[in-house]
């Protein structure tokens, strides 16, 4: 008669997260008299996760009713399963024993695989935002993974962006697995409707990959253009002077005129025209009268955007000219840039 | 026929070591757990150690714990017992038994006499 | 450790005779018992396991009884070669231990 061996007939199970692992073993003979115990892992740290004699293993079933004499199956099932969860089991035969049952025969040993879903890629942009022809870094975190490997790509309104370095963690063995990755993304004026996209593929989506965006209007500062024009003479001693702020993102926006550098008026921008690209155009005007002037009168339109230094844009009126016979686009002053900081 | 014929016996100062070896033929030694058993001179039986059939397991009672090893080389159909630190109460007649299944013992060999003496 | 006590430990009897002998466990092992004859010089020789079960090869004259604690090895017409040692064994719980043994002599 031969001795008894514990057979493990699978070498390897693959379960998903959250399924029902079954870990097959069979005895091949009743005896020696003794329980059954199932571990994870071998030697001394090894821990146990069935003892057929006693305890309270909530998370373990037996397939087969162990109290009956003549049972030789001692597989077992392990419900919700977790990456935690992955290891090497082993199925090992005690012998009765005082104090202490006494290990007599293992199992080969079966290695349970976890497939685990990665989370949802969160896309997170800089913490201030910058303006066209500036590059910007954008991050992408999932996690809870497992196996190991992972597809991640990047995409800008569709297209695949190549400027990217991505990390897997641990380099080692591990239950589950963590990736990150970032992009370097150059701005353009006609980015505020664009969208950038993290797009993760892996073994437990099958073949319908997770993707998280980041909107680059909340990442982009588009500056305003201005244009400051004299219209048509209203009345005989008012002239009609008009600042165009063109092409501005987002929409937080101070204009200020001055008349002679003294501030004339100051108002927000709130009936704003959009763009197609998403940008906003914003018109002000202000009514000069002409006869309170004995002099020339210097006009500069001042705009504060979004928090950010103020750009301005001047226009001279001459009193001594009739207001008829001013151009409708006088070239601002001489001194220089017609657009410029104010501090 | 199963045979177990057992060697390595002999004369060894207290605090001395010895090795002894089993031969076993007849049967397919690596299907068998074996084990030592010793018997002093007018004295009951006492089991020594105890090896699965692989090897992977042993056993030895707590009083023989630490002093006493037992090992296997399948390949040469062979058991052993390492003996260190022997004392006096070590003397014994020392058997080989076949012991499938940690059970009982099928059968024995003949013996090999230690003697622990200054 | 279960003790194995093992009566009685000497026992004159002739040829012919029916001889029983008794092991009593300190608990019960469950008929994990065997028996054993011993000759001097001679390697031991397994005649029953399980209390009741013969090893084969074993003349039918050998029989074993009992069960829980109490366990019996007759020999139901003594020959001459039955003249040796006998010893029980508890294999029930580790560590396995043996009775001290039944000398059978010829009267």
């Known amino acids: 008669e031969e001795e008894l061996q514990v057979i493990q007939p699978d070498k390897s199970v693959l379960v998903a997260a959250g399924e029902t692992a079954t870990l097959r073993c069979t005895a091949t003979s009743l005896i020696p008299v003794g329980p059954i115990q199932w571990f994870r892992g071998a030697g001394p740290g090894r821990e146990l996760i069935y003892n057929q004699k006693e305890g309270h293993f909530p998370r373990v079933t037996t397939v087969s009713d162990l109290t009956k004499r003549n049972n030789m199956d001692f597989s077992i099932r392990i419900g919700n399963i977790t990456p935690a969860d992955a290891g090497t089991y082993y199925c090992v035969k005690f012998r009765k024993g005082s104090p202490d049952d006494v290990e007599f025969k293992s199992g080969a040993g079966t290695e349970l695989s976890v497939r685990a879903k990665p989370s949802a890629p969160v896309v997170s942009g800089p913490a201030a935002r910058a303006t066209p022809q500036h590059t910007v870094s954008f991050t992408c975190e999932s996690h809870g993974f497992s196996p190991r490997d992972i597809t991640l790509k990047w995409f800008k309104n569709g297209n695949e962006l190549s400027d990217f370095q991505t990390n897997v963690d641990p380099v080692g063995e591990s239950v589950s697995y963590s990736i990150h990755s970032t992009a370097k993304v150059v701005l353009t004026r006609e980015d505020v409707h664009s969208q950038v996209i993290c797009e993760v593929a892996h073994v437990t989506l099958q073949g319908d990959p997770l993707r998280g965006t980041a909107n680059l209007s909340e990442t982009i500062r588009v500056p305003p253009t201005l244009e400051v024009t004299q219209q048509p003479v209203r009345a005989e001693n008012q002239v009609n002077v008009t600042c165009q702020v063109r092409k501005f993102y987002p929409q937080r926006l101070q204009l200020t005129w001055l008349e002679n550098g003294n501030v004339s008026r100051t108002e927000t921008a709130s009936t704003v025209t959009e763009n197609k690209d998403g940008t906003y155009n914003w018109m002000s005007w202000l009514l000069v009268n002409v006869s309170a002037h004995r002099d020339d009168v210097k006009l500069t339109c001042q705009v504060e955007h979004d928090g950010q230094p103020a750009v301005s844009k001047s226009h001279d009126l001459k009193v001594s000219a009739h207001p008829k016979e001013q151009g409708s686009n006088t070239a601002a002053e001489n001194t220089g840039s017609n657009e410029r900081n104010i501090y | 026929e199963v045979q177990l014929v057992e060697s390595g016996g002999g004369l060894v100062q207290p605090g001395g070591s010895l090795r002894l070896s089993c031969a076993a033929s007849?049967?397919?030694?690596?299907?068998?757990?074996m084990s030592w058993v010793r018997q002093a001179p007018g004295k009951g039986l006492e089991v020594v150690a105890t090896?699965?059939?692989?090897?992977?397991?042993?056993y030895e009672p707590g009083n023989m714990k630490g002093r006493f090893t037992i090992s296997r080389d399948n390949a040469k159909n062979s058991l052993y017992l390492q003996m260190n630190s022997l004392r006096a109460e070590d003397t014994a007649v020392y058997y080989c038994a076949r012991d499938p299944n940690w059970d009982y013992f099928d059968f024995w060999g003949q013996g090999t006499l230690v003697t622990v003496s200054s | 450790d279960i003790q194995m006590t093992q009566s009685p430990s000497s026992l004159s009897a002739s040829v012919g005779d029916r001889v029983t002998i008794t092991c009593k466990a300190s608990?019960?092992?469950?008929?994990?018992l065997t028996w054993f004859q011993q000759k001097p010089g001679k390697a031991p020789k397994t005649l029953i396991y399980?209390?009741?079960r013969l090893v084969d090869g074993v003349p039918s004259r050998f029989s074993g009884s009992g069960s829980g604690t109490d366990y019996t090895l007759t020999i139901s017409s003594l020959q001459p070669e039955d003249f040796a040692t006998y010893y029980c064994l508890q294999y029930d719980e580790f560590p396995r231990t043996f009775g001290q043994g039944t000398k059978l002599e010829i009267k």
């Open positions: 399980r209390a009741n």
């Open positions: 007849g049967f397919t030694f690596s299907s068998f757990s």
């Open positions: 090896i699965n059939s692989d090897g992977s397991n042993t």
């Open positions: 608990q019960d092992i469950n008929s994990y």
